[in-house]
């Protein structure tokens, strides 16, 4: 493993990375669930959307989220061409014109209505910690991931490589 500095090293230039092109390279409609198979659901309450983490009843339909994948160039630290590879950034939209946003001050994940171009707070770096699990790292706050806290989505600081595989920041994407 690579210790605390490893996470910081991975993400040190995240906020400097530039998204190449304004259109996504692909889009994917999927349901989002936690590592423990709880569903992420979205409910309209008092003209704003709330995000819940809950067990669904047997035949209850899962909410779908549109994931838009964007390519992002990462500034170089060692390669001669100025770019040290590409990252995948995603935006997550459960319903038209609404996107998940990172509220770094409140350490919360919120649904905001906004127009394109989307703000940086709506972009998350996609990580595969396992072959069938993904994690979402804030573009605006390297080392901070979407996670589950008290049956809600929250922003969780990951300060060591061991914690990158913590179950509460792992999510499953499913087409069903």
């Amino acid at each position: 493993a690579f210790g605390i500095s490893g996470v910081q090293k991975y993400t040190r230039a995240l906020h400097d990375s530039s998204i190449t092109g304004i259109s996504p390279i692909t889009e994917y409609l999927a349901s989002l669930s936690t590592y423990n198979d709880q569903s992420i659901t979205f409910a309209l309450e008092d003209e704003s959307y709330e995000i819940y983490v809950e067990d669904l009843k047997k035949d209850e339909k899962k909410d779908k989220v549109l994931l838009s994948y964007y390519e992002s160039q990462h500034p170089s630290n060692e390669s001669g061409d100025g770019v040290d590879g590409k990252m995948l950034m995603v935006t997550l939209s459960p319903t038209k014109d609404f996107w998940l946003h990172a509220n770094n001050k409140e350490h919360s994940v919120e649904l905001h209505k906004c127009e394109k171009p989307l703000p940086d707070q709506a972009f998350f770096v996609l990580h595969n910690m396992h072959s069938n699990c993904v994690s979402f790292e804030c573009k605006t706050d390297p080392g901070v991931f979407i996670g589950v806290k008290d049956n809600h989505l929250a922003l969780i600081k990951v300060d060591s490589s061991e914690n990158l595989c913590t179950e509460n920041i792992l999510f499953k994407l499913s087409e069903t």
Epitope: Y69, E78, G85, L88, N128, S131, N132, L164, E175
Partner: antibody, heavy 122, light 107 residues
């Protein structure tokens, strides 16, 4: 320039062991998933093993599970494939490959080594 | 496991011809589909990823399309240097699987 250089191939008897190495350079090694792919003489490509960028997860097809072990040493920017209980059907060129993007598996394998030949024969 | 069936297994076409290779998946998946070119004695080369994205440095005569279970690689105008074997590969579900390959020759 991204470079992947495999070594460690050779002739080995059935039941024997071999360790392949892949020396990586030109990129930040510990940001990428790495994968081994093999190709038997005159045949197609077969995925053999993958390891997460953290090194915390490893994946294999049934054909090699329990016999092959993928590992990485980020301090040396080197990928390994330990092959035990080798069989004649493991005879192939073994390629080391790198994922397309930081941190995840999406997007195929844009970088391949030159390959190292493993021959299992008595 | 997702089986990837490529067709045809081989083809012969004239320089300048439009060539189409198909890859049929045994079950649907997201578009994490790549195409590779492999020349004799060489390592494979990534041509297309995300089903339709052209890898840097690959000539624009190569294109990819498709989703779900049906994917296509097209060479709009076959060139002598395109003689090779072409493979599709799905990266959506483990185990990762490749198609059996399509050998392309010049008439």
């Amino acid at each position: 320039e991204v470079q992947l250089v495999e070594s460690g191939g050779g002739l080995v008897q059935p039941g024997g062991s071999l360790r392949l190495s892949c020396a990586a350079s030109g990129f930040t090694f510990n940001n990428y998933w790495m994968t081994w792919v093999r190709q038997a003489p005159g045949k197609g490509l077969e995925w053999i093993a993958s390891i997460t960028y953290t090194g915390g997860g490893t994946y294999y097809p049934d054909s090699v599970k329990g016999r092959f072990t993928i590992s990485r040493d980020d301090s040396k920017s080197t990928l390994y494939l330990q092959m035990n209980s080798l069989r004649a059907e493991d005879t192939a060129v073994y390629y080391c490959t790198r994922a397309n993007y930081y941190y995840n598996t999406y997007g195929g394998f844009p970088y391949w080594g030159q390959g190292t030949l493993v021959t299992v024969s008595s | 496991d997702i089986q990837m069936t490529q067709s045809p297994s081989s083809l012969s076409a004239s320089v300048g011809d439009r060539v189409t290779i198909t890859c049929l998946a045994s079950e649907g998946f997201s578009n994490d589909l790549a195409w590779y070119q492999q020349k004799p004695g060489k390592s494979p080369k990534l041509l297309i990823y995300a089903a339709s994205r052209l890898q840097d440095g690959v000539p624009s005569r190569f294109s990819g399309s498709g989703s779900g279970t049906d994917f296509t690689l097209t060479i709009s105008s076959l060139q002598p240097e395109d003689v090779a074997t072409y493979y599709c590969q799905q990266g959506s579900k483990y185990p990762l699987t490749f198609g059996g390959g399509t050998k392309v020759e010049i008439k």
